[in-house]
Interface confidence: low
């Protein structure tokens, strides 16, 4: 998998001294812009959320209903770059915004390095799934959340829910078999209703194989990298980041570690 450059990411995020962070990899091609518009705006091809057909009952945990339970919107965002092997996750590639699903060139190549910031949270070791990782004080720009584990054989789904009370600010849901296709669905649950889905056709997870998910919080979006490759970006729909105080991790995985660090 391509990795991304932490230096580039920092440079692209307005960090005045990106060179202060070592790069773990060589100079790979920089990330290009992502075609297509990112949220806000309408996502083409979306299903109207109106009655959200098949929606899980109020209070139901997302991902437990059949795949049709989530409204079917579209445009995927591009996400953060990965991290250095064994280190803490890298930052997202600097590109512009997310590409449309499957759009050529939508997923930039990146190279990355990781900061020497220490993680907070859970020690490495098997964790019970579903697992709730507290995010004291909420999330904030430059916070990096790293989740490591292994996908179970014959997996159906993985779910990450960045929660704000009963709401889900960022629902990241790789689905291994939605109508015989693999897709990543991102969404927000607000006022007990799911919004417009953003769907991503790039699918870096494999049943039975280990994974590393890194989520970098930026001022206006979450960036996600998987196995040190930039995957997608999801624009904030809830602005009160400091109130997003819990990360729920569930699905068909064994969880080795989950932590967060400021980079």
């Amino acid at each position: 998998a391509d990795s991304f450059s932490l230096n580039d990411a920092l440079a692209g995020s307005g960090n005045p001294n990106p060179q202060g962070y070592p790069g773990a990899w060589g100079n790979q091609p920089g990330a290009g812009g992502y075609p297509g518009a990112a949220y806000p705006g309408a996502y083409p091809g979306q299903a109207p959320p109106g009655a959200y057909p098949g929606q899980a009952p109020p209070g139901a945990y997302p991902g437990q209903a059949p795949p049709s339970a989530y409204p079917g919107p579209t445009a995927p965002g591009a996400y953060p770059g990965p991290t250095a092997p064994g280190a803490y996750p890298g930052q997202p590639a600097p590109g512009a915004f997310p590409g449309q699903p499957g759009a050529p060139g939508a997923y930039p190549q990146c190279s990355g390095g990781y900061p020497a910031a220490g993680p907070y949270g859970v020690p490495a070791g098997p964790l019970t799934v579903p697992y709730d990782l507290p995010l004291p004080g909420g999330v904030m720009p430059r916070m990096l959340i790293t989740i490591m584990g292994t996908v179970k054989p014959n997996a159906n789904r993985i779910v990450l829910d960045f929660r704000r009370g009963n709401d889900v600010a960022f629902h990241f849901n790789p689905r291994f078999n939605e109508n015989n296709r693999r897709v990543i669905v991102c969404n927000t649950k607000q006022d007990n209703n799911w919004g417009k889905e953003e769907r991503q056709s790039a699918f870096p997870f494999e049943s039975g194989k280990p994974f590393k998910i890194q989520v970098l919080v930026e001022a206006d979006h979450f960036k996600v990298a998987v196995n040190d490759a930039h995957l997608l970006q999801y624009n904030h729909r809830m602005k009160n980041l400091r109130e997003i105080s819990q990360l729920g991790i569930s699905g068909d995985i064994t969880l080795t570690s989950a932590n967060h660090a400021m980079i």
């Epitope: 806000p40 309408a42 109020p58 704000r164 607000q190 006022d191 007990n192 729909r237």
Partner: antibody, heavy 117, light 110 residues
Framework: EVQLVESGGSLVKPGGSLRLSCAAS????????MNWVRQAPGKGLEWISN????????YYADFVKGRFTISRDNAKNSLYLQMNSLRAEDTAVYYC??????????WGRGTLVTVSS | QSVLTQPASVSGSPGQSITISCAGT?????????VAWYQQHPGKAPKLMIY???YRPSGVSNRFSGSKSGNTASLTISGLQAEDEADYYC??????????FGGGTKLEIK
Amino acid sequence: EVQLVESGGSLVKPGGSLRLSCAASGFTFSNYNMNWVRQAPGKGLEWISNIDGSSRYIYYADFVKGRFTISRDNAKNSLYLQMNSLRAEDTAVYYCVRSYYGGMDVWGRGTLVTVSS
Amino acid sequence: QSVLTQPASVSGSPGQSITISCAGTSSDVGGYYNVAWYQQHPGKAPKLMIYYDSYRPSGVSNRFSGSKSGNTASLTISGLQAEDEADYYCSSSTGYSTRVFGGGTKLEIK
């Protein structure tokens, strides 16, 4: 049937206090953020306050901060608005409203609050 | 004074289409917040017609549509009918749960 019914509106003197109540039925009350919205006679709508399902996150419009307090009792399926230091300009119909993904989909019929000496 | 600016009134004949604008700023309408539209008949409570910029709740006629461009949102009503005569209000978030309304637009059917 999903329903919201406000009560507690009355005539009150300037500087006085009043507590409005809203009884919710037909839906799982604790799952929804709730709002108070008001409308002065012949005027437009004004958002007052919002409270989430667990009463953890509460927001107010600037013009009522420090004077009005929103609260809820999920066990009683009830929403409340405690109004203190009332002014003539607070005269309005007060609506209890359910949040719906950035909109407000269920409205009560409203209760009239008149502030006058 | 309302934060969002709407025309005080618009008019149209039965069968025609009309558009009501709602001008805001990058901090409300132009942000990635949701715009909603409400219809209010005299003496009645408002009714949600459009939410999340352009989506209709179930039960709302498809003659009503919403859109947003830059810092301005719009409500379009096609095939005007007598029962559409009412006041229309736009609303936008300025933060996760804070909201502001427009001053309202009176729609007159000629």
